[in-house]
């Protein structure tokens, strides 16, 4: 078979002329190889220069082919986290807004006056969700403790409160016995039900982000001197063969590609941290409705005034008792008794049907909806990396032409030795290139911990808790459906079977690099847009 | 393999509310990533996806539906179903249950039934 | 929601033929497209998925290709068992949608 391979380098200057390479270093026929430090040293048409040159670029075209094959992961990742991101911060100014609005509506210029608490709240609640701020069971403390300094003196406006009185008060509020209870259990309440969500939805936008950080380092693969020589011998030399249109064996690409990315895959971790954000987005859009606890922020604060309102002889009488008899307002300083109005009224908040949506049209649902459709293309990618690369037609012949003679590595032929899978103790005998069977690189590891960390806190997140330290299931009950949820994770929300795989595809570039990614097969990776 | 089975009234008056059943055999309705979906096809006019409920409890409507329609799973039973109410002669087609995965086409499908809004 | 336009809405083509029907999506779709065949008093059956990817069990001679907004779906040479209405359908973004559908008929 190797009488048929040219003696004529016609093929290699065409090709490596058109690359930019001086024609005066390609030889118009073969020459003696001896020279070669890679390629067999037969007959070529390299020289040493042209050999260094393309072991460069063929390392060039690996690492930019698996680049290309994950940046539809990149870009998914990140826009699906932009999306998230703005869609939270946006639900929680839309909250803050409707509670202005229902709030001045409600208790007109008492509102007005004592606004800067409310604000106060959401701002820190932003703080929580954007990693920045302290815990939310102390904001939420203050915050109700703020709000009883502001509102206890407006029910008894024949008494002075001076300021150790109210921070007797404040602090009688948030003693841990519980013994006063001025809002009734509405603090506790939205405590839960605030902490349950914001701490899913930063965990949610967190393992996004994590996710999109962790794949593109993961891309940038780093080439060995052992992978680097195989690549050579894959797809440069051919060219120093002096047939550049013989397309390596698809057995050998595989074999090649799988020992250079032998310690680099991300899998099972991948699978999980895939799992954990679907099950987490799940919750978000379910029982922790990070729409519903928006909305009902206002709502809870309302209910707790007006308990207070309605027990204030009760609870007036045990701070009285606690703090002792505060001292009257001498009568012509009295104020008069506010309106009965601005005293606060029942007030109930008016429940839409429709979703909250935001300003840009959307709502958790649709997001939710779209997140799943393309966190399906992700499934399996690690795994299938490999068969993306060798889809490339610079890589290797169609896989389709099993038959058909190809580059062997040492001419035109079938490729006899073994394929090797892709496992560390596969890869012990991969025939190609010698491969560490230690297992995955430190940096890989490094990437794994942090997905797994990742899965960690979303895992954690989902069934109503904080890895950091603070607990939101403290009445399980929750909105519903806890249980099943516990399930579902362990069961791991399982990939329905595997089609068939299709032809991997060369990658696919616009010009905002939002598109692209490698071949895929249904039900599991492929192609997809970055939103 | 999965099959679908759409059963219900092949008749119903207008204003009333249309309930199709569709039974799943091969599969558990319970399983993980799956969307369980209702399409509609009008007598000689195209497809129209009504809605579809997630193996979660999550449900997908068609907005132009949304109002009339509600779409359930009994997993004890291994099936799904759909109500439309207050239908009206624009809602006489050919009513389709399907199976949907993430990412992926419907497939399988049930063999369809034709309810007819007729008084 | 998302616009599917197809065409033609019917043609007529002789055994042997290679046909071509087209559909637009009214915004970027990616690749998140299928395509369909529907014969009469049937439920619909997946050809292509993900535009351009044959599915396990359908004959060679059909194949889809696009991305973005415009997609083909061709035969590449015409069979009696063909003769159908042929449906494309976006999958990006909520509510599904669609295309009106293309009826193929042999001359």
């Known amino acids: 078979s190797e009488a048929k391979v040219t003696r004529s380098c016609a093929e290699t200057r065409q090709v490596l002329g058109a690359r930019g390479y001086s024609l005066n270093l390609i030889p118009p026929a073969l020459i003696s190889g001896e020279h070669l430090r890679v390629c067999p040293q037969e007959y070529t048409c390299c020289s040493s220069e042209t050999e260094q040159r393309l072991i460069r670029e063929t390392e060039a075209t690996f690492r930019g082919l698996v680049e290309d094959s994950g940046s539809f992961l990149v870009h998914t990742l990140a826009a699906r986290h932009r999306k998230f991101d703005e869609f939270f911060l946006e639900m929680l100014s839309v909250a803050q807004h409707s509670l202005t609005q229902l709030f001045s509506h409600s208790y007109g210029r008492l509102y007005a006056q004592h606004a800067l608490i409310f604000n106060g709240l959401f701002s820190r609640l932003r703080d929580f969700y954007g990693e920045s701020g302290e815990g939310l069971d102390d904001t939420l403390a203050d915050f109700w403790a703020q709000l009883l300094e502001r509102v206890f003196p407006l029910l008894h406006p024949q008494y002075s409160f001076p300021p150790d009185y109210l921070l007797c008060l404040s602090r009688l509020a948030s003693s841990t016995d519980g013994s006063l209870q001025p809002f009734g259990d509405s603090p506790r309440r939205l405590r839960l039900q605030i902490t349950r969500t914001l701490v899913a939805a930063r965990a949610f936008v967190q393992g996004l982000e994590t996710g999109r950080n962790v794949v593109s380092e993961a891309l940038k693969v780093p080439v060995s001197e052992g992978c680097s020589q195989a690549l050579m011998r894959l797809i440069g030399c051919p060219l120093c063969r002096g047939v550049p249109s013989l397309m390596p064996c698809q057995g050998f690409c595989l074999n090649v590609v799988r020992g250079c990315l032998s310690s680099r895959g991300l899998e099972p971790d991948w699978g999980n941290y895939l799992d954990g954000l679907l099950i987490l987005a799940d919750k978000l859009q379910g029982p922790f409705s990070f729409e519903l606890t928006a909305e009902s922020i206002g709502v809870k604060i309302s209910e707790g005034l007006m308990y207070l309102q309605e027990n204030s002889a009760k609870v007036s009488a045990q701070v009285f008792q606690e703090c002792g008899p505060p001292d009257p307002v001498p009568a012509r300083n009295r104020r008069a008794p506010p309106p009965r109005e601005e005293a606060g009224r029942l007030w109930s908040m008016v429940t839409e049907e429709e979703r909250p949506t935001t300003a840009a049209g959307t709502n958790l649902h649709r997001l939710v909806w779209e997140l799943r459709e393309r966190l399906a293309r992700m499934r399996g990618f690690w795994a299938r990396l490999s068969l993306t690369v060798c889809g490339d037609s610079r890589m290797a012949a169609d896989a389709s032409l099993e038959a058909a003679p190809c580059w062997t590595g040492a001419g035109r032929g079938r490729y006899l030795p073994p394929v090797v899978g892709g496992s560390p103790a596969e890869q012990v005998n991969n025939p190609e290139l010698k491969v560490d069977a230690s297992g995955p690189d430190v940096p890989t590891r490094r990437r794994r911990l942090q997905l797994r960390a990742a899965t960690a806190r979303m895992k954690t997140a989902a069934l109503g808790h904080d890895l950091d330290g603070q607990d939101a299931d403290e009445d399980a009950s929750g909105s519903g459906g806890g249980q099943q949820y516990a399930d579902d994770w362990m069961a791991g929300a399982v990939a329905p079977p595997a089609r068939p795989p299709r032809p991997p595809y060369p990658p696919r570039r616009d010009g905002s690099g939002g598109k692209g990614g490698g071949g895929s097969a249904r039900y599991n990776q492929g192609r997809s847009r970055s939103g | 393999q999965l099959q679908l089975q759409e059963s219900g009234p092949g008749l119903v008056k207008p204003s009333e509310t249309l309930s199709l059943t569709c039974t799943v055999s091969?599969?558990?309705?319970?399983?993980?990533?799956?969307?369980w979906s209702w399409i509609r096809q009008p007598p000689g006019k195209g497809l129209e996806w009504i809605g579809s409920?997630?193996?979660?409890?999550?449900?997908y409507y068609n907005p132009s539906l949304k109002s009339r329609v509600t779409i359930s799973v009994d997993t004890s039973k291994n099936q799904f179903s759909l109500k439309l109410s207050s239908v009206t002669a624009a809602d006489t087609a050919v009513y389709y249950c399907?199976?949907?995965?993430?990412?992926?086409?419907?497939?399988?499908w049930g063999q369809g039934t034709l309810v007819t809004v007729s008084s | 929601d998302i616009q599917m336009t197809q065409s033609p809405s019917s043609l007529s083509a002789s055994i042997g033929d290679r046909v071509t029907i087209t559909c637009q999506a009214s915004?970027?779709?990616?690749?998140?497209l299928n395509w369909y065949q529907q014969k009469p008093g049937k439920a619909p059956k997946l050809l292509i998925y993900?535009?351009?990817n044959l599915e396990t069990g359908v004959p060679s001679r059909f194949s889809g290709s696009g991305s973005g907004t415009d997609f083909t779906f061709t035969i590449s040479s015409l069979q009696p068992e063909d003769v159908a209405t042929y449906y494309c359908?976006?999958?990006?973004?909520?509510?599904?949608?669609f295309g009106q559908g293309t009826k193929l008929e042999i001359k």
């Open positions: 993900d535009a351009s």
């Open positions: 359908q976006q999958y990006d973004n909520l509510p599904i949608t």
């Open positions: 091969g599969g558990s309705i319970s399983s993980s990533s799956y969307y």
């Open positions: 915004q970027d779709i990616s690749d998140y």
């Open positions: 399907a199976r949907r995965v993430s990412g992926h086409p419907f497939d399988p």
């Open positions: 409920i997630y193996y979660s409890g999550s449900t």
